[in-house]
């Protein structure tokens, strides 16, 4: 480790005196930092000598000597005070720049250590410091403002009490820069815009930033618009607002608008689309099929998407029949707005009853007129089956009627013994009726079909069963011939 002579750590001299600082090390040594022209520097073997014949207050500072070849990187320092009764301060820099929340060193060095007790920091022209300015003082380094805040970027002076009066240093300008976390924050309002030709429109692009150095512009397609900018400072952020006001829009105003803001951290942009139309419009659509089939007792949500400009003046769901004059309960109708011009309307139909099948219409109105979208709701039913014995053209016939939706298909089974329902082990014969006769097929209602089984002689010890089946379920009816006629069994539920 190098050694400085005189030994220090401080040396106090008067202006005009000669000062010699010698640094000695094992190898070559050098003095740190720029040496002012008032000093003479020469090497003498393993030592380096700094000398001045006329010390001034400006020589007040810390002088450090290092030994470049030392692996431990040791250094020695001496602090020189040149105590000038007229100049209590040596200011090493007139401007200091730090980031917010860093410590800011204001390098005013006291030229006489005796004055340390009476030092203070003030703002330019003796103004007090800003409230809650937390600072400390080191005679070797100057004043340190701890965790500097943006607002503490001021012009400061160091003050020393000399013979009962305060003597000020020249001023030091402190600049405290805000830490910019990223590009400015942006808003572009509205997110989308539709206007009829000739109407007025307004698009507002605003950006905010933690400091004042940022730019913002509004662009139409690829053209940068010249719009006057309104500036403000609010909630600790700088705001810049561009407002595009159009008295009477035309088709050339339509297109993409981008709000672009930039600062030292980069660029941020957001866009919206402006559509100009000839006249009002109202479009209704559904992602669902307009023909709906639901099993009785289940629920259904009917959804309509509406695109409209201007906004809707009225809308409602209507039941068009054919069963009853009931209307959907308002509490079952729900409206959600996806954005300014698109809405979704939902009608909830829980636990559907037979009388609720039919046509449901959504009607909407705006200045463009009325529009309607109609759903056709058919309920699905499992088959209901009944069998009777009759004589047709003198022949004994089993007549099976099956009713359900979708249209049921019919199968006849003959099985051994008397039973309420044939199981697979007992089946002797199966007849599938490929084309049962349709007795009734009205919209939104069950389809009733009829199937005939002609039997010359019905065997007494056997059961005949009619089974009907559709996508919802199945139903059956068993018929048992007896000597005095016949008896029938509906299946056990």
């Amino acid at each position: 480790i190098p050694v400085i002579e005189p030994s220090g750590p401080e040396l106090v001299v008067k202006p005009g005196e000669t000062v010699t600082l010698r640094c000695v090390g094992n190898g070559s040594v050098e003095w740190d930092g720029p040496i002012s022209p008032h000093w003479t520097l020469y090497s003498d073997g393993p030592s380096s000598v700094l000398t001045t014949n006329n010390a001034t207050f400006q020589n007040t500072r810390t002088y450090r000597c290092t030994e470049p070849g030392d692996p431990l990187g040791g250094s020695a320092a001496i602090h020189l005070y040149v105590k000038d009764p007229a100049r209590p301060w040596n200011v090493l820099a007139k401007e200091v720049v730090v980031f917010e929340d860093q410590d800011a060193l204001l390098p005013c060095l006291l030229t006489d250590p005796v004055l340390e007790a009476g030092v203070s920091l003030v703002r330019l022209r003796g103004r007090p410091l800003l409230r809650h300015t937390n600072y400390s003082f080191s005679p070797w380094h100057g004043f340190i403002i701890h965790r500097a805040k943006f607002i503490q970027g001021q012009d400061y002076q160091c003050s020393a009490l000399m013979g009962g009066r305060k003597v000020m240093s020249i001023s030091i300008r402190l600049k405290v820069q805000k830490v910019i976390p990223g590009p400015p924050a942006l808003t572009l309002v509205p997110a989308e815009l539709v206007r009829i030709r000739g109407e007025a429109a307004q698009i507002v692009c605003s950006a905010s930033n933690i400091d004042v150095d940022f730019d913002v512009f509004l662009q139409h397609n690829t053209t940068k618009l010249a719009i006057p900018q309104r500036s403000d400072f609010h909630d600790n952020r700088y705001q810049k607002v561009l407002t595009l006001s159009l008295g009477q829009v035309d088709f050339q105003h339509a297109g993409n608008y981008s709000c672009v803001a930039s600062n030292v951290q980069g660029k941020h942009s957001t866009s919206m689309f402006f559509q100009v139309v000839e006249s009002a419009y109202l479009d209704l659509s559904s992602e669902q099929n307009l023909i709906q089939e639901v099993t009785v007792g289940e629920g259904l949500n009917l959804k309509v998407m509406v695109e409209a400009y201007p906004g809707l003046q009225g809308f409602n769901w209507t039941y068009l029949g054919p069963f009853s004059d009931h209307q959907p309960e308002p509490k079952l109708a729900n409206a959600t707005t996806k954005d300014t011009y698109r809405h979704t309307f939902t009608l909830s139909l829980p636990r559907l009853k037979p009388s609720e099948a039919g046509r449901y219409s959504f009607l909407a109105r705006n200045p463009g007129g009325w529009r309607a979208l109609t759903f056709e709701l058919t309920l699905r039913y499992p088959p209901e089956v009944s069998v009777i014995w009759t004589s047709i053209n003198g022949s004994g016939t089993l007549l099976c009627a099956a009713s359900g939706y979708p249209q049921p298909n019919v199968t006849w089974l003959q099985c051994a013994g008397h039973t309420d329902r044939c199981d697979e082990a007992q089946v002797l014969q199966v007849w599938v009726d490929p084309h049962p006769e349709v007795l009734s097929q009205e919209p939104f209602q069950k389809v009733t079909v009829q199937s005939l089984l002609t039997a010359e002689t019905l065997e007494h010890n056997q059961t005949y069963e009619c089974r009907a089946h559709n996508s919802v379920g199945s139903g059956s009816w068993a018929f048992i011939p007896i000597s005095a006629g016949a008896r029938t069994h509906p299946p056990d539920e």
Epitope: E100, D101, R127, P128, L129, L130, R131, H132, N134, K149, F150, I151, G153, Q154, V212, F233, H234, N236, Y238
Partner: antibody, heavy 122, light 111 residues
């Protein structure tokens, strides 16, 4: 709910001292400077001083140096103000008020205690 | 110390009308576009309540009928429309430097 609960009214004799307290609840005590403000009919609102609960560092209005001493007890989140050598001039309502310590620079007193009335009379 | 002068000392305003209170500082309380002037409301027997901080920022929970403006040495508190419950004394306060100082107060009466 933020609360600054001050001690009750005091009737003291001239020349005596009084110590009033301000208990903070529902706040992080060390996030706020605690200020003390005097309100007397003739003089309006006067700032006495503040204390930083983190390090006990105080700043006083020159006018109240030697009159008021501010202290804190971090463990009980309570701030204290002692007034000494009391005279009739010190009869007033004294408020504690918090002021946020942050990178914001506003230093407004956003919550106040209910006030402590001090009457100096022989 | 910075002296704050409020005017008027008192005013009477009809319900629903505008009340305007002025506060003038003996020197600037603004720096870097930050205006260190605040407004408080005090009702009889109660402690002061912060209304506006940094000249124009509405404190949380304060009705929007209160607004503040101004910079450097001249600041204004506006209440519009005035309501019955606004009858109180209003103080301005600066916090740019020590000691913080308060205005003398303006007493608002509702007619």
């Amino acid at each position: 709910e933020v609360q600054l609960q001050q001690s009750g009214p005091e009737l003291v004799k001239p020349g005596a001292s009084v110590k009033i307290s301000c208990k903070a609840s529902a706040i992080t005590f060390t996030d706020y400077y605690m200020n003390w403000v005097k309100q007397s009919p003739g003089k309006g609102l006067e700032w006495i001083g503040d204390i930083n609960p983190n390090n006990g560092g105080t700043t006083y209005n020159q006018k109240f140096k030697g009159k008021a001493t501010l202290t804190v007890d971090k463990s009980s989140t309570t701030a204290y103000m002692e007034l000494r050598s009391l005279t009739s001039e010190d009869s007033a309502v004294y408020y504690c008020a918090r002021e946020k310590i942050s990178m914001e620079y506003y230093y407004a007193m956003d919550y106040w205690g209910q006030g402590t009335s001090v009457t100096v009379s022989s | 110390d910075i002296v704050l002068t409020q005017s008027p000392a008192s005013l009477a305003v009809s319900l629903g009308q505008r009340a305007t209170i002025s506060c003038r500082a003996s020197e600037s309380v603004s720096s870097h576009d930050i205006h260190l002037m605040h407004w408080y409301q005090q009702k009889p027997g109660q402690s002061p309540k912060l209304l506006i901080y940094a000249a124009s920022n509405l404190e949380s929970g304060v009705p929007a009928r209160f607004s503040g403006s101004g910079s450097a040495t001249d600041f204004t508190l506006n209440i519009h429309p005035v309501e019955e419950e606004d009858a109180a004394t209003y103080f301005c306060q600066q916090s740019i430097e020590d000691p913080p100082t308060f205005g003398g107060g303006t007493k608002l009466e509702i007619k």
